[in-house]
């Protein structure tokens, strides 16, 4: 059929909860292409009707929710003007047993469900939630050994659980839970994460580099909306936290009431020797109190600030 078979991706999935997989393969999917999903070499494409339990949503295949019978090989066909590529995705559905204490870890989980915390350091766990824009995700709750996590050493920030001064007792089975809303219906997502510990530095003692900001000022009009990116390069297996702070407080906490200034979701691009991370800060409306205040971007031991200033008056 003239289609290039690219690779086979294996995914272990939990029954009875939503799952989505995005058919992206840069640079193929960055141009003008059409994406169509099929199941088990069927000639009939997956439905695009949003009421269907399994349907295609733009480049995604979405299961609301996943069921036992959904195990199998799915193909996404990427057609360009002069090209055709096919990605094979092998989905295996299993019954989740997060609260079964006889299960010492879940060995067949994919890597993002196995995470490592570094003893004595401030570190974090990530709740990996890959869903299309049509899915609205609620706040994340974190559990350890089936008990909701509380205590001042733990802070929930976006999709991460920040753990300060990691101890040996922090190892074990975790789960992050979120309510997903799609077309008015609600579904529970519960991701189990097996967390191990290490004393190893992990990133060879190198320090993350903040490319921007550079302890600089930005001229911005009062009342405007402003988005500033913090760009950071760091080693591939770093465990550094990246965040924005003001007055030594996470901006999301500092502006918890008004939510006028928020930290964005972290993204990253992978290069051969390092990762480039971007985490933005959004000022929905710049106020007088924001001027002259250092907004700090932190990455591990590195930090850099931006300071807002009023534009110089134009006397022309």
């Amino acid at each position: 059929d003239g289609c290039n078979d690219i690779f086979m991706k294996n995914e272990m999935l939990s029954a009875s909860q939503p799952f989505a997989f995005n058919c992206t393969f840069p640079p193929i999917t960055s141009g003008e292409v059409s994406v169509t999903w099929y199941k088990n070499s069927s000639k009939i494409p997956v439905s695009k009707i949003i009421q269907s339990r399994i349907h295609q949503d733009e480049t995604w295949i979405l299961f609301l929710p996943m069921e036992w019978g959904d195990s199998g090989v799915y193909q996404c066909v990427i057609k360009g003007r002069d090209s055709c590529h096919r990605i094979h995705v092998n989905l295996t559905v299993f019954e989740k047993q997060w609260c079964d204490t006889s299960v010492k870890g879940l060995p067949n989980l994919s890597d993002e469900y196995k995470q490592i915390l570094h003893l004595g350091k401030d570190d974090s766990l990530t709740c990996h939630l890959h869903f299309p824009k049509s899915c609205i995700l609620g706040p994340i709750k974190w559990y350890k050994d089936c008990n909701e996590i509380t205590g001042e050493r733990f802070t929930v920030l976006e999709t991460r659980l920040l753990v300060s001064n990691v101890s040996a007792e922090d190892r074990g089975n975790y789960a992050c839970q979120v309510i997903l809303t799609h077309s008015g219906k609600q579904y529970e997502v519960l991701n189990g994460i097996t967390v191990s510990i290490t004393e190893r530095a992990g990133y060879g003692g190198s320090v993350p580099k903040i490319i921007y900001p550079k302890n600089n000022s930005i001229e911005v009009q009062l009342g405007t909306t402003l988005i500033v990116d913090c760009n950071i390069t760091d080693t591939k297996d770093n465990t550094n936290l990246r965040c924005w702070r003001v007055n030594n407080t996470l901006v999301d906490d500092y502006y918890n009431e008004s939510k006028r200034i928020r930290e964005g979701v972290e993204t990253h691009a992978s290069f051969r020797e390092y990762n480039l991370y971007t985490v933005n800060i959004t000022f929905l409306e710049v106020k007088m109190e924001d001027y002259g205040l250092p907004f700090m971007c932190h990455a591990g031991v590195s930090a850099a600030y931006i300071m807002l200033q009023l534009p110089a008056p134009d006397f022309r």
């Epitope: 010492k104 870890g105 060995p107 890597d111 196995k114 490592i116 003893l119 004595g120 040996a168 190892r171 074990g172 097996t194 967390v195 191990s196 510990i197 290490t198 004393e199 190893r200 530095a201 992990g202 990133y203 060879g204 080693t235 591939k236 297996d237």
Partner: antibody, heavy 120, light 106 residues
Framework: EVQLQQSGPSLVKPSQTLSLTCSVT??????GYWNWIRNFPGNKLEYM?????????YYNPSLKSRISITRDTSKNQYYLQLISVTTEDTATYYC??????????????WGQGTSVTVSS | EILLTQSPAIMSATLGEKVTMSCRAS?????MYWYQLKSGASPKLWIY???NLASGVPARFSGSGSGTSYSLTISSVEAEDAATYFC?????????FGGGTKLEIK
């Protein structure tokens, strides 16, 4: 159950390169830390280095100019290369990994060991 | 580099005797790991995170210590305990092993 199977020559000539393979079953080398350790005659253990889940490598500074640890995720194997060997490198070489009771540094799983003699 | 000094280098014990071997670190160590090595076999994880026994290790073994001083104790030695025991640290690189304590049974 995690198993580590070692392969490679037992005799290497001085100034040549020692190359060993560790084949892993029951776990993915894209999780955790994958170590090499050697035991010299007379029972002296030396930690040589590791390759991590992301491909990051750590080498013992005493070996840094001569050692290379690499991996092939498609084969679920990792490798040790030691260049310019001398008779001082005669030892039993082990690959090992942790993760026991969620502790990456507890080296619970070991290969069977490869006894390497450096001799002309 | 953290130097781990094990003492004694060789010790001899009679069946049923209580024995303690020591591992001293040249700088503070967060946790100590112990391995058992018998001739012709691969090392076995024996004690991890200073005081936790690995699977299959008899309850007569125990580990303790903090800072720069750690020890492995056998409450009542049995014949199968004859082996060399190594301590190891992952707190500071380069990661190091002690010189070992060889336990012989009289």
């Amino acid at each position: 159950e995690v198993q580590l199977q070692q392969s490679g020559p037992s005799l290497v000539k001085p100034s040549q390169t020692l190359s060993l393979t560790c084949s892993v079953t029951g776990a993915s080398i894209t999780s955790g830390y994958w170590n090499w350790i050697r035991n010299f005659p007379g029972n002296k253990l030396e930690y040589m280095g590791y390759i991590s889940y992301s491909g990051y490598t750590y080498y013992n500074p005493s070996l840094k100019s001569r050692i290379s640890i690499t991996r092939d995720t498609s084969k679920n194997q990792y490798y040790l290369q030691l260049i310019s060997v001398t008779t001082e490198d005669t030892a039993t070489y082990y690959c090992a990994t942790g993760g026991y009771d969620y502790v990456e540094d507890a080296l619970y799983y070991w290969g069977q060991g490869t006894s390497v003699t450096v001799s002309s | 580099e953290i130097l781990l000094t094990q003492s004694p280098a060789i010790m001899s014990a009679t069946l049923g005797e209580k024995v303690t071997m020591s591992c001293r670190a040249s700088s503070n160590v967060r946790y100590m790991y112990w391995y058992q090595l018998k001739s012709g076999a691969s090392p076995k994880l024996w004690i991890y995170l200073t005081s936790n026994l690995a699977s299959g290790v008899p309850a007569r073994f125990s580990g303790s210590g903090s800072g720069t001083s750690y020890s492995l104790t056998i409450s009542s030695v049995e014949a199968e305990d004859a082996a060399t025991y190594f301590c190891q640290q992952f707190t500071t690189s380069p990661y190091t092993f002690g010189g070992g304590t060889k336990l012989e049974i009289k």
